[in-house]
Interface confidence: low
């Protein structure tokens, strides 16, 4: 498939707070956002993140399958027994002002087409597209049991989409993303990504004070 | 003063979407969030950001006084005539669940005390403290005309506060931040910062598509 096998690239997901809007999804209390910035990851031979990541000063932490930290930071004694799979990704977008709202059905169809054709993600993994102007939410869901050999991972699809939206396309020699709904350009001004793991993350209550 | 003179440290501000809650502030449409991740900044001899920043591959952009990008990225022909001042900062926090909501007056007083005593920020620059459980918003305002010699810059105070909240205190040889309201620990689980400049930022409509 053409979307990345090397999910280790996913280093730029951004942080956000949940929305309280009516038709939008409220991220789970266990949802992760990447607020650690960039780091130089350890990858296994297949290009997956190693469950434990450490920096040059031997501070270590556990990550999920998209490389986002899911534990407190510790020292070299920290153990990460398994790479926990991210099975639900919520991509939260805010589009630039338009003459009117996009038609929800048209928007839904266009985004599903995009994930199918550009990122080669099987349509069954795009669980929902929510819209309340100017916020769009795309839900990707993919359990371990659902993912067959050759299926693009939702983490890879989300990462390629994120980079496309930011005008930093990872597709060599292909045009940048020109996203349109019924001919009207869809211009994204903010992208926020939440990751939900099959096993809830483990943070102490006191980690930030 | 003990808070940083070197505002060039401010590299980790995070991105978010505006809140629609009743008693909370809605950031201006011109508010900036730093969604570019870390970069190695050019600083002037006084430790201020140079108006133009470029990365190692010579992509350049203009920044404000807290180092957040305020123009589209361009090439080496890009000119940034002046360092535009950030005069309004909105710090948006979400605290961890507590038995009940904090008393707004107590919370307001404690945060004002913290900014005055720990970050040496003159009380007149803390414009407001808003609270709607679990969201706290601290508004800092400081026009060029208001800032006297020796006054701590709101950008420095915000940066030191952000690092304290994240358990990464920049105060050498002083204890970490133990924030309490009437003895009850205030544990922050998410921090989002918006920056508003004296001159609105200049982004093209098409910058992300």
């Amino acid at each position: 498939h053409t979307a990345a096998q090397d999910n280790c690239l996913l280093l730029k997901a951004r942080m956000s707070a949940p929305k309280n809007a009516r038709t939008l999804v409220r991220p789970s209390e266990h949802a992760l956002v990447d607020n650690d910035g960039l780091y130089d990851p350890d990858c296994d031979p297949e290009g997956r993140f190693k469950a434990r990541q450490c920096n040059q000063t031997s501070v270590c932490w556990c990550v999920n399958s998209v490389g986002v930290r899911r534990t407190d930071k510790g020292d070299l004694s920290l153990r990460c027994d398994e790479l926990v799979r991210t099975h639900h990704i919520l991509i939260d977008l805010r589009h630039r002002p338009t003459a009117g709202a996009f038609n929800h059905s048209d928007l839904d169809a266009e985004l599903r087409r995009l994930f199918r054709e550009r990122y080669r993600l099987h349509p069954k993994f795009v669980a929902a597209v929510h819209y309340e102007q100017p916020t769009i939410q795309i839900e990707l869901r993919q359990n371990t049991s659902q993912k067959a050999a050759g299926d693009v991972d939702i983490g890879d699809a989300a990462y390629y989409f994120e980079r496309d939206i930011k005008g930093e396309s990872l597709f060599q020699g292909r045009g940048g993303l020109d996203l349109r709904v019924r001919g009207e350009p869809l211009q994204v001004e903010r992208t926020l990504i939440y990751y939900l793991d099959e096993i809830p993350p483990k943070f102490s209550m006191k980690r930030l004070t | 003063h003990t808070a940083a003179q070197d505002n060039c440290l401010l590299l980790k501000a995070r991105m978010s979407a505006p809140k629609n809650a009743r008693t909370l502030v809605r950031p201006s449409e011109h508010a900036l969030v730093d969604n570019d991740g870390l970069y190695d900044p050019d600083c002037d001899p006084e430790g201020r950001f140079k108006a133009r920043q470029c990365n190692q591959t010579s992509v350049c952009w203009c920044v404000n006084s807290v180092g957040v990008r305020r123009t589209d990225k361009g090439d080496l022909s890009l000119r940034c005539d002046e360092l535009v001042r950030t005069h309004h900062i909105l710090i948006d926090l979400r605290h961890r669940p507590t038995a009940g909501a904090f008393n707004h007056s107590d919370l307001d007083a404690e945060l004002r005390r913290l900014f005055r005593e720990r970050y040496r920020l003159h009380p007149k620059f803390v414009a407001a403290v808003h609270y709607e459980q679990p969201t706290i918003q601290i508004e800092l305002r400081q026009n060029t005309s208001q800032k006297a010699a020796g006054d701590v810059d709101i950008g420095d105070a915000a940066y030191y506060f952000e690092r304290d909240i994240k358990g990464e205190s920049l105060f050498q040889g002083r204890g970490g931040l133990d924030l309490r309201v009437r003895g009850e620990p205030l544990q922050v689980e998410r921090t989002l910062i918006y920056y508003l400049d004296e001159i609105p930022p200049k982004f093209s409509m098409k910058r992300l598509t």
């Epitope: 930093e168 | 470029c54 190692q56 591959t57 010579s58 992509v59 361009g74 022909s77």
Partner: antibody, heavy 121, light 107 residues
């Protein structure tokens, strides 16, 4: 492999026009800007300007505004430098160099072999 | 325009020597300086960009340093094939400008 192949040497008279070519191969032509650099005999390197290979928009250094023109034939992955109303001081070797814009590499990582233009009456 | 000044037009050296070439910018160019090697009858070849980053495939005997206005290019152990003209170039702002070049020759 990545290379820039320039057209052969030119001998011209003052007042004539010359058009030299630079054909790119081994990479996506429109992903990198094309720069032109002049080197007079026994002298150093002088940046003439560049052309945005995505949009075709040229940018000229002050000294090279007027008689000099950059152009493209994108389908052939080729950039051109045309010099009108040639003068003796245009005698030089002209190099094309791959550079960039946007995600910008403004040093030149790939160079053509150079085209020598001699202007003599 | 930013002027790049290479103080030595010629430098004499011997095989195995360490040699440093300096370049001074007329104004602050951060770390945006590249170094090129040009041999007679050939096109220039980039060795260093962004002051200290060695371009792909360039031997590690070539190093660069500096920031702001003062830059240095060093060959730790000169080899016969290193005899050439070396140019600095600022890639900070257009118009891009080169130094006049320093010719490295044998003593």
């Amino acid at each position: 492999q990545i290379q820039l192949v320039q057209s052969g040497p030119e001998l011209k008279k003052p007042g004539e026009t010359v058009k030299i070519s630079c054909k790119a191969s081994g990479y996506t032509f429109t992903n990198y800007g094309m720069n032109w650099v002049k080197q007079a005999p026994g002298k150093g390197l002088k940046w003439m300007g560049w052309i945005n290979t995505k949009t075709g928009e040229p940018t000229y250094a002050e000294e090279f505004k007027g008689r000099f023109a950059f152009s493209l034939e994108t389908s052939a992955s080729t950039a051109y430098l045309q010099i009108n109303n040639l003068k003796k001081e245009d005698t030089a070797t002209y190099f094309c160099g791959r550079g960039g814009y946007g995600s910008s590499y403004w040093y030149f990582d790939v160079w053509g072999a150079g085209t020598t233009v001699t202007v003599s009456s | 325009d930013i002027v790049m000044t290479q103080s030595h037009k010629f430098m004499s050296t011997s095989v195995g020597d360490r040699v440093s070439i300096t370049c001074k910018a007329s104004q602050d160019v951060s770390i945006a300086v590249a170094w090129y090697q040009q041999k007679p009858g050939q096109s220039p070849k980039v060795l260093i960009y962004s002051a200290s980053y060695r371009y792909t495939g360039v031997p590690d005997r070539f190093t660069g340093s500096g920031s702001g206005t003062d830059f240095t290019f060093t060959i730790s152990r000169v080899q016969a094939e290193d005899l050439a003209v070396y140019y600095c170039q600022q890639h900070y702002i257009t118009p891009l400008t080169f130094g006049a070049g320093t010719k490295l020759e044998l003593k």
